[in-house]
Each structure stands twice: as C-alpha cells, then as structure tokens.
C-alpha cells in the first residue's frame, strides 16, 4: 500500500521559519503534490503550494519556496511575518496524486515541545483518500 | 466550460461605496483561490485582492488595504469584492480571476467597469 | 514593490515576422513570470507561465524566456489575430505587479 509521510521542521536559526518536508513511499508516477494547511486539501485546508513534475510550482503567502528534492519528495518553506509564529500547532497535509494508485494524503506537525532544528518524525498519519 | 461573470459596476461618487460580484460556474468554486484585478483607463493591470481557497486567508496590496474586503459565498458559488472609501484613481475595469493548477490568473470575466466621479 | 518595466510601449511589426517583446524587473524574480495578451476590447489571456511554459491552448509561435530579472516573450511568424497588447506579471512576490504593457501593431 502506498504511503505518504510528513515532516514538519523548525528552522534553527529562524524561529519564524518552518520548513515541510513530504514523501511518497509506493510505485508509480506522481502527477501533482498539493500542500494545505489546516487539514487536509478540500476539507477545510488552505492550499499552499502545488507542485507539477513538469509544469513548475505555485505557491501562496505564508510559503516562501517550494521544490522538489526527489522524484517522490517535495520541500516547502514558509515564511511568518507577525511577531509570533502560527506554524507551531498547525497542521500540514501533503497530497500525492499518483498513477495508477490515485491520491494518498497525509498530515503532521511540529512536535509541541520540539525544539529548533527538530523534525516531527515521518510517520505518515494516513487519511485514507485514494481517489 | 469555466465561467466567471462580473457584476456592480457603476458611477460612484468619491468616499463612497460599492459591492462587486462575480458569478462562477465551470469549475469546482470551493477549491481555487480567486483575486480581483483591476485594470486603470490607461491600460494598467493591478492585482486588487487574494482569497485562499477554504476563505480563511486574504491578500491586499497597500493601496487598498482596509478599504476593500474580497469574500465567497461557497454556496452560491460567487466571489465579492466590496469596496468602500473610494478615490478617483480606484476608476478601473475589475476583473474577476482564478487559476488552473499552477498558471496564475488563467481564466478571467468580461469585466464590471466601476468609475469614481464626483 | 517590485517594477516590471517594459520599455517600448509601442512595437511595429508585418506579418510573417518575429518579434521579441521584452520585460525587467526591478529585483530578481526567479522565473515566476507570465506573459498576458489582451485583444481590443477583450479580457487579458494567460499566454505564458513560469517565464517560459506556453498556456492550453496557446500557438507554439509564442515562446517565452529569461529569469531573475530580464524576461522575453517572442512570436516567430507573427499573424493579423496578434494585434495586441502584451503584459508582463511577476508572482514571485506580494504585491503581484505587472509591466506596463507592449502594443504590438501590424505593419
């Protein structure tokens, strides 16, 4: 069964700044990578970024950047602007569409006692969609 | 086919007010950002506003900051932008907008004109 | 804010011909750039993203290209329907900003 996992980092030198980081564990080719936050996308998540293999990104306020670092795995950074960052108790979902399994779309979150440069570990929490 | 139809346009007089609607069919409404951008008599372009897709983010340059407010009604499928304090230079052609997947401001209305005039 | 220039307002050209429409902006933008043609009386159309990635649906004579700061949308055999004009927009950035516009006239 495929998998998707979530990491969700603190920057260490930059307290306002997170980075997501998300991979896909199965076969075939991923066709788009949707990031949202606040749950999962379409279901009360707001879209951050979507990344197409080809195409290039698109991304929106808070994030700063988003690339691919392998063909099955995404980074996105995100910037906050305010004094205190809302990115700690937030939940981030990346969602793989892939051929031929379909969609598979999981969430994570930095730790609540995480400290900078920690990672929440990448353990998928599956929300099963394959679509 | 994707269909996006402006409404509200008129004359108004400077310091006053004006709702904008845009009428979206063709596409699913609830899970694309939607922007207004509007376009001066002089031809020039301007991103006015942002609304994320769940409606729980929106984006303003400096110039229209705290004067106009961009909203969605999901059931209706109809974006708004309302626009209040109004200036002589927010005359323009305002045009409703969205994307596909990641080409930015790929489909656009026909336009509503609004003109500031006293 | 970052100023998308397109330093000729006006560009002459004939049928049959190529030409290069060009933009700067005023810091880098990366490739986030596309490239709009508005018709005379029309709604703009999305042409180009990406700085050069051509839109569904849009003729392979248009091509875009450039990064950072210098961007180029050329039309090789340029037909009558191109009677235009052409915008620039970068999206690396809030606030989104667009060039001033190029009118592309036909000889």
């Known amino acids: 069964t495929p998998e998707v996992w979530v990491q969700v980092q603190m920057e260490a030198t930059e307290l306002s700044s997170f980075t997501v980081h998300c991979g896909f564990l199965g076969p075939g080719s991923i066709s788009l990578v949707t990031v949202s936050w606040g749950g999962p996308d379409g279901a009360g998540g707001t879209k951050l970024a979507v990344l197409h293999p080809e195409l290039g990104t698109r991304q929106w306020a808070p994030a700063r950047q988003a690339r691919w670092e392998t063909q099955s795995s995404i980074s996105l950074a995100l910037e906050d602007s305010g004094a205190s960052s809302p990115f700690a108790n937030t939940t981030f979902c990346c969602k793989f569409a892939s051929f031929p399994e379909g969609s598979w779309e999981s969430c994570g979150s930095l730790p609540p006692s995480s400290d900078p440069g920690l990672s929440a570990p990448p353990t998928p929490v599956p929300i099963l969609r394959a679509d | 086919d994707v269909q996006l139809v402006e409404s509200g346009g008129g004359l108004v007089k400077p310091g006053g007010s004006l709702k904008l609607s845009c009428a979206a069919s063709?596409?699913?409404?609830?899970?694309?950002?939607m922007y207004w951008v509007r376009q001066t008599p002089e031809k020039r372009l301007e991103w006015v506003a942002t609304i994320s897709d769940g409606a729980s983010y929106t984006y303003y340059p400096d110039n229209v900051k705290g004067r106009f407010t961009i909203s969605r009604d999901t059931a209706k499928n109809n974006l708004y932008l309302q626009m209040s304090h109004l200036k002589s230079e927010d005359t323009a052609m305002y045009y409703c907008?969205?994307?596909?997947?990641?080409?930015?401001?790929?489909?656009w209305g026909q336009g509503t004109l609004v003109t500031v005039s006293a | 804010d970052i100023v998308m220039t397109q330093s000729h307002k006006f560009m002459s050209t004939s049928v049959g011909d190529r030409v290069s429409i060009t933009c700067k902006a005023s810091q880098d933008v990366g490739t986030a750039v596309a490239w709009f043609q508005q018709k005379p009386g029309q709604s703009p159309k999305l042409l180009i993203y990406?700085?050069?990635t051509r839109h569904t649906g849009v003729p392979d004579r248009f091509t875009g290209s450039g990064s950072g700061t210098d961007f180029t949308l050329t039309i090789s055999n340029v037909q009558s329907e191109d009677l235009a004009d052409y915008f620039c927009q970068q999206y690396n950035s809030y606030p989104w900003t667009f060039g001033g516009g190029t009118k592309l006239e036909i000889k």
């Open positions: 990406w700085a050069s």
């Open positions: 063709g596409f699913s409404f609830s899970e694309n950002y």
């Open positions: 907008t969205r994307d596909e997947l990641i080409a930015p401001f790929a489909y």
